[in-house]
């Protein structure tokens, strides 16, 4: 059941990113570190970089509430066992600052791409009977 809940949470994050993509014009047009083509076993490290990024509502009024709620939900921390498991074999993942900085639209697209990749990895690890999650 924990595995299922974990997968639901990851897919929920994908939906949150999708919702935020509707509001890119209401986000502060700041350039943010946006990992891309993340190396195997560095997915959780890159995920953490996305979560740490200062994505912000431009406070332009109408959609401010849903944007702020969504951003806060994107920062929900997964249990450290999940975050640590895939990285146990690799100690040297790139620092957040080393990733190319992108505006909110591309930042969200890259975040979604990483979440999709992690979702597929999780599915395949379950199919092959691995305990990784």
């Amino acid at each position: 059941q924990g595995q299922d809940r974990h997968m639901i949470r990851m897919r929920q994050l994908i939906d949150i990113v999708d919702q935020l993509k509707n509001y890119v014009n209401d986000l502060v047009p700041e350039f943010l570190p946006a990992p891309e083509d993340v190396e195997t076993n560095c997915e959780w490290s890159a995920f953490s970089c996305f979560q740490k990024a200062q994505l912000k509502s431009a406070n332009t009024g109408n959609n401010e509430r849903i944007i702020n709620v969504s951003i806060k939900k994107l920062k929900r921390k997964p249990p450290s066992t999940n975050a640590g498991r895939r990285q146990k074999h690799r100690l040297t993942c790139p620092s957040c600052d080393s990733y190319e900085k992108k505006p909110p639209k591309e930042f969200l697209e890259r975040f979604k791409s990483l979440l999709d990749k992690m979702d597929h990895q999780h599915l395949s690890s379950r199919t092959h009977g691995s305990e990784d999650s």
Epitope: G2, H6, I8, Q12, D15, I16, Q19, I66, S70, P79
Partner: antibody, heavy 126, light 106 residues
């Protein structure tokens, strides 16, 4: 069982204040965001306010902003709504509702209000 | 802010018939963010559907939700006497409700 019980409603004059309470039981209150929703007589549902599970963020409908304050005491499993400068248009049944998206990664994940109280009636009249 | 428009305002049907309720959003809504509630007279609302199509705990399978983007639908496949009530859609996050659709006995 999971339960929310509102109290504190009553008849109050315009411009006066009232504090509503919502007692939660049967679940880990401190891991859920909470809402107040109201319903004027014969009307639809109107969301009023939301507070994050740990009280770190609060959101309000424009119609109550600056007049109403949502708060919570996790040690008492209780949600509050302080209503100041009450107006006739605040007359309604006030419901507290649990946000279905738990802060726990492995907890409930519903994007909706999954548990509701029975409501308490507030009448603002001179 | 997003506006949710429900139609029809009232639906007059007989028990056993199929009910189709519509909820249209003024801007695109991620399906995870769309919920449906049922409210009977003198009672609190009850969560029926979350994530546009997932039934909440204890909700019978005659209730189903569908849709994406700006158009969402709640379908009751065969109306039971206890289904006659008011139904509301809601966007999560802004927590805006639609104005409601009343399903009444014909």
């Amino acid at each position: 069982q999971v339960q929310l019980v509102e109290s504190g409603g009553g008849v109050v004059q315009p411009g006066r204040s009232l504090r509503l309470s919502c007692a939660a039981s049967g679940f880990t209150f401190s891991t859920y965001g909470m809402h107040w929703v109201r319903q004027a007589p014969g009307k639809g549902l109107e969301w009023v306010a939301f507070i994050w599970y740990d009280g770190s963020d609060k959101y309000y409908a424009d119609s109550v902003k600056g007049r109403f304050t949502i708060s919570r005491d996790n040690s008492k499993n209780t949600l509050y709504l302080q209503m100041n400068s009450l107006r006739a248009e605040d007359t309604a049944v006030y419901y507290c509702a649990r946000d279905g998206d738990s802060s726990d990664w492995y907890g409930d994940y519903y994007f909706g209000m999954d548990v509701w109280g029975q409501g308490t009636t507030v009448t603002v009249s001179s | 802010e997003i506006v949710l428009t429900q139609s029809p305002g009232t639906l007059s049907l007989s028990p056993g018939e199929r009910a189709t309720l519509s909820c249209r959003a003024s801007q695109s809504v991620s399906s995870s963010y769309l919920a449906w509630y049922q409210q009977k007279p003198g009672q609190a609302p009850r969560l029926l559907i979350y994530g546009a199509s997932s039934r909440a705990t204890g909700i019978p399978d005659r209730f189903s939700g569908s849709g994406s983007g700006t158009d969402f639908t709640l379908t009751i496949s065969r109306l039971e006497p206890e289904d006659f009530a008011v139904y509301y859609c809601q966007q999560y996050g802004s927590w805006t409700f639609g104005q409601g659709t009343k399903v009444e006995i014909k």
